[in-house]
């Protein structure tokens, strides 16, 4: 008799754990910026504080009739999904509601900003336990709304936002496009993307993960014990806000970066049918459905990494793409991807004290993506070693020469634009372990890290016959930190990481051109963290 | 994630109005004006004036007051609806779009964003 969505996101071992703390005495507080809500509903009564905050535009139309239960519908349902007694994800959590959406579900960027400022002021006046802010709303891309989310996130608040219901790229909407926000798309009971009329869930690189968002049973504002089902990315975001609240009630010191990494790591992978998304968005959209992670005590000090895609560079000759990790994360490797295969590679550089991953378009190219591998490495000390391009016919070698530093990623950047001149760069694990090798006209960048117990190794997989892609996975217990494509076809599209899988993509036309001796190789750098061990390179 | 995607950014570095104030005449607008790419979602007439990160509390108020004063000299009444201190320095203002060029030339202004709708999802 448990609703499908709760069964999906809360594994069996957590169901019983929850029963031991009925009304929870958690200090986590969730702030909901939405419509007004019905505080007397049995699902949320006693858990919800309806603040006096109200910043909404007038309803449209002269004949609009304000009916309380309709005005409260969206917010009441979401409050119930987060902390409802019977259908809530985090049943013990206290919730504060701020009214930023009117009876028609419309608000303004300015009203939302004032709401976020109200939360910041409350935090300053009366510091409390961990705060989660749920933003089940979306408007067009707004630089200031994203900036406000960034500022609030940097004070330790965790923001969770709806990806949007426009069947579009979430990066075109705010707050969904703010990197500091956990952005949630919606899936149904079959783990497929939610369709809503002619539209549906948003997608793309700005979505962090998906969660149940179709036919979700929750509190109905029609009466104090009524329930109804609602659908949308708001419901999906409410599930993740509930999961985050539960994670923080167990471990109040978890940071935003840790929460996001754990949500990604423990989500259900590869169940979404990516064909629902536009072809150009499929590689950028995470195939992840949220589940409640176990506590860090149960899972030990795993090395956690995620892939961050840049925006598309655009097609101009010198266009660059930049991918950034969160401030707490380490950029362990940088790769690039171009649908046309015309790219001049990738490199890591420091901008304003932060390492960023950059990729460069080539003449005649349609644009590139930079792909950063962002990891949580406690007490890490990472640096970049680079060697300029060697003379024609010579190889360039870069390795980690500092003591106890291990290679976590390689990047290659070609000075020449003539794609026919250059050969693909390579990692060489055979002769000298832990070394990046570049071929003609390639500058080589090695990402080298020292951290207690960090050990890494290279794993390669090659295919000689025709193939659109070559993959290699890190085995259980190891985490993919670097991913490159090694010499093979004269034209590769690039390489990127999908969870623990390194994907090297080959241009369609290049498949026919290849001689049998030219294998395309996907090379993965796999690392693990064993706190008791010394940093080492595994051959 | 935060690249300015489908977004309108207009440079309004308009010539200074004949106002006789040295600091205004000397200040060429480097600030930009931004608005939602979806026209139906725009709220013209309400603007969020975002100031540089390090702007002090008193300077925020002075900038808002300066805008009101200069607008009044041109025969416009503007209303400061809210001043942002805690998350970012700035203020929310109701005014004619005719005054955007003037507002962009104020000291401390980083950019101005036209207000727009957000929707329940």
């Amino acid at each position: 008799s448990i609703p499908w969505n709760l069964e999906r996101i809360i594994p069996a071992w957590h169901q019983t754990e929850e029963d031991r703390s009925p009304d929870g005495s958690s200090q986590v507080e969730v702030y909901l910026l939405d419509t007004s809500i019905q505080g007397a509903h049995r699902e949320i009564e006693g858990r919800v504080t309806i603040t006096d905050f109200n910043s909404v535009p007038e309803e449209d139309g002269t004949r609009f009739h304000r009916q309380a239960s309709k005005c409260d519908s969206h917010g009441t349902h979401l409050a119930g999904v987060v902390s409802g007694r019977d259908a809530g994800v985090a049943k013990g959590t206290s919730l504060h509601s701020l009214r930023v959406l009117n009876c028609q579900g419309k608000g303004t960027v300015s009203g939302t900003l004032i709401g976020l400022e109200f939360i910041r002021k409350s935090q300053l006046i009366q510091p409390s336990g961990p705060l989660v802010v749920l933003l089940p709303l979306a408007g067009g891309y707004s630089r200031i709304l994203n900036a406000a989310c960034r500022h609030l996130a940097r004070t330790g608040v965790v923001l969770v936002a709806a990806a949007g219901n426009f069947r579009d790229d979430a990066c075109l909407y705010s707050p969904a496009s703010a990197p500091e926000v956990i952005t949630v798309g919606a899936t149904n009971a079959q783990d497929q993307p939610v369709t809503l009329g002619t539209l549906g869930t948003n997608f793309g690189r700005c979505v962090d993960l998906f969660a149940p968002g179709k036919d979700i049973i929750g509190a109905s504002s029609d009466c104090s014990t009524c329930f109804m089902s609602q659908s949308g990315t708001s419901q999906a975001a409410a599930h993740v806000a509930g999961i985050v609240a539960r994670m923080l009630s167990r471990e109040p010191t978890l940071t935003l970066a840790e929460l996001r990494q754990r949500l990604i790591h423990f989500s259900t992978k590869d169940v979404i049918n990516m064909a629902w998304f536009p072809e150009d968005q499929q590689v950028l959209t995470p195939n992840l459905v949220a589940t409640l992670p176990p506590s860090t005590h149960e899972t030990g000090g795993q090395l956690l990494c995620r892939t961050v895609w840049s925006a598309h560079s655009g097609p101009t000759r010198t266009a660059t793409a930049t991918a950034r990790c969160a401030p707490e994360e380490e950029l362990l490797s940088c790769s690039s991807f171009s649908r046309s295969g015309r790219r001049r590679g990738d490199w890591i550089e420091a901008i304003g004290g932060q390492q960023v991953c950059k990729a460069l378009n080539a003449f005649g190219g349609e644009g590139v993506y930079a792909v950063a591998r962002c990891c949580l490495v406690p007490r890490a000390n990472c640096s970049i070693h680079n060697t300029p391009a060697a003379r024609a016919g010579l190889e360039t070698h870069v390795h980690c020469h500092q003591k106890d530093h291990v290679l976590t990623g390689c990047s290659f950047h070609w000075e020449v634009e003539d794609l026919s001149v250059r050969r693909q760069p390579a990692l060489r694990s055979r002769r000298q372990p832990g070394q990046c090798v570049g071929h003609q006209a390639a500058s080589v960048y090695a990402s080298c890290c020292h951290a207690p117990g960090l050990e890494c190794k290279i794993k390669e997989h090659g295919i000689s016959g025709p193939s659109e892609q070559v993959t290699v996975a890190c085995e259980a217990g190891w985490t993919l930190t670097g991913c490159n494509v090694l010499p093979g076809a004269s034209l590769t599209l690039g390489a990127y990481s999908v969870d623990n899988l390194c994907v090297a993509r080959v241009h369609d036309t290049a498949r026919a051109d290849r001689t049998s001796g030219e294998a395309t190789v996907a090379a993965a750098i796999c690392c693990r963290s064993r706190p008791s061990a010394k940093a080492s390179w595994v051959q | 994630q935060d690249e300015d995607g489908d977004y309108e950014e207009l440079m309004l570095a308009l010539p200074s109005q004949e106002d006789g104030l040295a600091d205004e005449a000397a200040h060429v607008a480097t600030a930009t004006f931004r608005r939602c790419s979806k026209e139906a979602w725009r709220l013209p007439g309400t603007y969020i004036v975002v100031l540089m990160e390090e702007t002090q509390r008193l300077q925020i108020e002075q900038t808002a007051h300066r805008l009101q004063t200069r607008a009044a000299r041109r025969g416009y009444v503007i209303k400061v609806l809210h001043i942002f201190y805690d998350l970012f320095p700035g203020f929310l203002v109701k005014m004619s779009s005719d005054l955007l060029g003037l507002a962009l030339k104020l000291p401390h202004v980083e950019y101005i964003e036209e207000d727009s709708f957000v929707f329940a999802q």
Epitope: R42, A87, C223, T225, C226, F227 | -
Partner: antibody, heavy 126, light 106 residues
């Protein structure tokens, strides 16, 4: 079929705490589909809902009585209990326990009080 | 708090007659209203829920109607066992009961 039976002292002194237990038979109190409620009826008067509880011990009280009421559940004994503190003569009533569908699972039946126990009279007097 | 007012307080009728009981709410309760029957020394029994749905085992002579603030319980032809007190109850906002209507034999 499901039956509910109230038990507890019939006489309580003013300012003391009234304690009653409802024993459920013919069904499990541990079902997530139901709430378990207390309702009272002063002699010759109407009915008043006191509060409800679910199998997890999550409670929902009448705002006018909230400060004095505690409802608890013991799933191992298939019982739930009522404590009403600082009683006065105005608390003299027949106290009923009843089942109520939570509403989360519509198939569980109507979201109202059904069935009820037969009631127990509690008199507050010194 | 939503106040439910029942009328009349007492209804004196003979077996076979039609009984019409009224319940008025101080504000809209939509269709979230139920009717209960209580006989002396017994617990109340659910008759009608959500304004017009008969509970399991309730004879067809009992029917409910109304929505918003005005509701009616109708007993088309009174049987001897129908003489009792009838209460309405709402769940739009918390739970409150009406004061009751006593249906007695004339």
């Amino acid at each position: 079929q499901l039956q509910l039976q109230e038990s507890g002292p019939g006489l309580v002194k003013p300012s003391e705490t009234l304690s009653l237990t409802c024993t459920v038979s013919g069904g499990s109190i541990g079902s997530s589909s139901y709430y378990w409620a207390w309702i009272r009826q002063p002699p010759g008067k109407g009915l008043e809902w006191i509060g409800s509880i679910n199998y997890r011990g999550s409670t929902y009280y009448n705002p006018s009585l909230k400060s004095r009421v505690t409802i608890s559940v013991d799933t191992s004994k298939n019982q739930f209990s009522l404590k009403l503190s600082s009683v006065t003569a105005a608390d003299t009533a027949v106290y009923y326990c009843a089942r109520e569908n939570s509403g989360v699972v519509p198939a569980a039946g109507p979201n109202w009080f059904d069935p009820w126990g037969q009631g127990t009279l509690v008199t507050v007097s010194s | 708090e939503i106040v439910l007012t029942q009328s009349p307080a007492t209804l004196s009728l003979s077996p076979g007659e039609r009984a019409t009981l009224s319940c008025r709410a101080s504000q809209s309760v939509s269709s979230y209203l139920a009717w209960y029957q209580q006989k002396p020394g017994q617990a109340p029994r659910l008759l009608i829920y959500d304004a017009s749905n008969r509970a399991t085992g309730i004879p067809a002579r009992f029917s409910g109607s109304g929505s918003g603030t005005d509701f009616t319980l109708t007993i088309s032809s009174l049987e001897p066992e129908d003489f009792a007190v009838y209460y309405c109850q709402q769940r739009r906002n918390w739970f409150t009961f009406g004061g009751g209507t006593k249906v007695e034999i004339k």
